[in-house]
Interface confidence: low
Amino acid sequence: QDSRGCARWCPQNSSCVNATACRCNPGFSSFSEIITTPTETCDDINECATPSKVSCGKFSDCWNTEGSYDCVCSPGYEPVSGAKTFKNESENTCQDVDECQQNPRLCKSYGTCVNTLGSYTCQCLPGFKFIPEDPKVCTDVNECTSGQNPCHSSTHCLNNVGSYQCRCRPGWQPIPGSPNGPNNTVCEDVDECSSGQHQCDSSTVCFNTVGSYSCRCRPGWKPRHGIPNNQKDTVCEDMTFSTWTPPPGVHSQTLSRFFDKVQDLGRDSKTSSAEVTIQNVIKLVDELMEAPGDVEALAPPVRHLIATQLLSNLEDIMRILAKSLPKGPFTYISPSNTELTLMIQERGDKNVTMGQSSARMKLNWAVAAGAEDPGPAVAGILSIQNMTTLLANASLNLHSKKQAELEEIYESSIRGVQLRRLSAVNSIFLSHNNTKELNSPILFAFSHLESSDGEAGRDPPAKDVMPGPRQELLCAFWKSDSDRGGHWATEGCQVLGSKNGSTTCQCSHLSSFAILMAHYDVEDWKLTLITR
């Protein structure tokens, strides 16, 4: 025992009571309250074990220590006091920590941190989802490609970060009462033409299309060089009377006056209707045919060149003017019996028959439409009866196959051909110029003139002409010719029959046609022998 009369053998975590006894320190316990032998031990009391004598209070945990215990705030909570430990419920100031405020980047891009009692969770913003690798990182949900089809079929789904929009497609607008953007958007085609939202040049006409529009050249106008037709930026120029000038080297006062008058008409056509312009052009042509003046004195090749140009120009101008007319048939017969028949209608592939007293034709409407021009298609017949002066002394070009056939029939060579024109000269034209070889042939029926125009004076009536010996009824067309100005030809045309004062032909190309009676001058081999 020591000087204080205490036992020296007291076990660890105990204190002596006297020389023969010890007691465990607070927080420790032994088998008996008073320790009397050195073999006894003082063991730590776990104040936190249940049933616990200690109550730390809410949001806290009990931590046992050697000989004691601590109350600490649970993870996610902190004491307001600032003291890390406390001993009982009355000292408890634990309160929730807002981790979201403490660390705003706990939840990564496009995630929202939500504080919970003692913790936090990450939630993706609407329109986002967690990436598989990390449940704290949100990525955009592409509603447009996720198979949800959230938008009406009239709209375009537009994914944006965290959301999507149902926007009207370009050239569409929300139907009345519909928004433009939310998922209940419903759209309809904007008619930019009638609503004035188009930007077509004044030289064009606006055509509405689904979701857009196009600008087409006004009738009688053509796209400026290098600019395609039927685009939003199409710009056109007037082409109505662009080529009405006498052929080079032709000197004729009558012809010059005629062309001047046509040019005047061209200027007036900006203010006149197409119908009036058509009638005025035909009137000028009739006047020229009836009073050819000094044209009559010109050499045949020059007259034939004038005929070639006149027929070509008339075809061009009638085609252009026809495009300004309303859809449907159009007919005009001048006092001199020059006839114009037009058919203007939408594209299609039905067979169409058209014409009047001088000429009729049957064609598949797809042939008339062609490929380039998307507007209504045009087919026309211009029948000019009085072309004697211009076509007098015109020759017929016999192509080699025809020549061979004739020489086989007559068993002799052909020395020449005399021609008698039995019908009006009928210029046939379509919406397009691509008529050198048609996809399907066109049938024509050309009426014979009451008194046929033999190109060299008057002949007896030709209503029902039967070919005599060495004569043949031909379906001929006028062909440009650099040497002779122009001539008659028959390639690609065949006569199908003739009755009731009319001859029916079938041709695989277009031009100006006429029914001719050809009288072949055949070399008489017997006579040749005698004269030898």
Partner: antibody
Framework: QVQLQQPGAELVKPGASVKMSCKAS????????IHWVKQTPGQGLEWIGA????????SYNRKFKGKATLTADISSSTAYLQLSSLTSEDSAVYFC?????????????WGAGTTVTVSS | DIVMTQSQKFMSTSVGDRVSVTCKAS??????VVWYQQKPGQSPKALIY???YRFSGVPDRFTGSGSGTDFTLTISNVQSEDLAEFFC?????????FGAGTKLELK
């Protein structure tokens, strides 16, 4: 085509502010966020922040808070970056860029950049 | 902030060579990395997204690889038009951060 147009250059005095524009065209302005990036020879490319033109929500790099303010005008399809209390440290090229998002998460269209020179 | 380190400021190469530009993130960024190419006087142009996916129109001589913290942009058969500065950028967490750039120059 999709474009972001920025003025070429701004010359400003120290202590002053500058507000640069980024005009969007060729797409729906409100459908994509516009981000701003600073480029200097010393610091390279630094992300300043972003704006959602549809609702005006912004997100800033902590480093540029108080220095940069992002706004957008839907009527003119234009985003703006305003820099205040300018110092020579703010001399840089400032790019606006469209953030594509979706499956890609990148800047798909950039403006040509505005060169800001802070000098007295 | 996540720091994107491009340790090489400059890299010398020759036309036809193969060159690899590296980028290291200061913490795990998954595959949330984009590579940009910037030519003098121009704005950056994206080449690679999600660390290894090439944007359409980008020549297939550009390839990206890596995940976590280490990323590489490889240019095989270098062409003269490839001479530019290349930046990596992470988008894993805000603020978005870029590498300092690696300038590719001719030897």
């Amino acid at each position: 085509q999709v474009q972001l147009q920025q003025p070429g250059a701004e010359l400003v005095k120290p202590g002053a502010s500058v507000k640069m524009s980024c005009k969007a065209s060729g797409y729906t302005f409100t459908s994509y966020n516009i981000h701003w990036v600073k480029q200097t020879p010393g610091q390279g490319l630094e992300w300043i922040g972003a704006i959602s033109p549809g609702n005006g929500d912004t997100s800033y790099n902590r480093k540029f808070k108080g220095k940069a303010t992002l706004t957008a005008d839907i009527s003119s399809s234009t985003a703006y970056l305003q820099l205040s209390s300018l110092t020579s440290e703010d001399s840089a090229v400032y790019f606006c860029a469209r953030f594509y998002g979706g499956s890609y998460w990148y800047f798909d269209v950039w403006g040509a950049g505005t060169t800001v020179t802070v000098s007295s | 902030d996540i720091v994107m380190t491009q340790s090489q400021k400059f890299m010398s190469t020759s036309v036809g060579d193969r060159v690899s530009v590296t980028c290291k993130a200061s913490q795990n960024v998954g595959i949330n990395v984009v590579w940009y190419q910037q030519k003098p006087g121009q704005s950056p142009k994206a080449l690679i997204y999600s660390a290894s996916y090439r944007f359409s129109g980008v020549p297939d001589r550009f390839t990206g690889s890596g995940s976590g913290t280490d990323f590489t942009l490889t240019i095989s058969n270098v062409q003269s038009e490839d001479l530019a500065e290349f930046f990596c950028q992470q988008y894993n967490s805000s603020p978005l951060t870029f590498g300092a750039g690696t300038k590719l120059e001719l030897k």
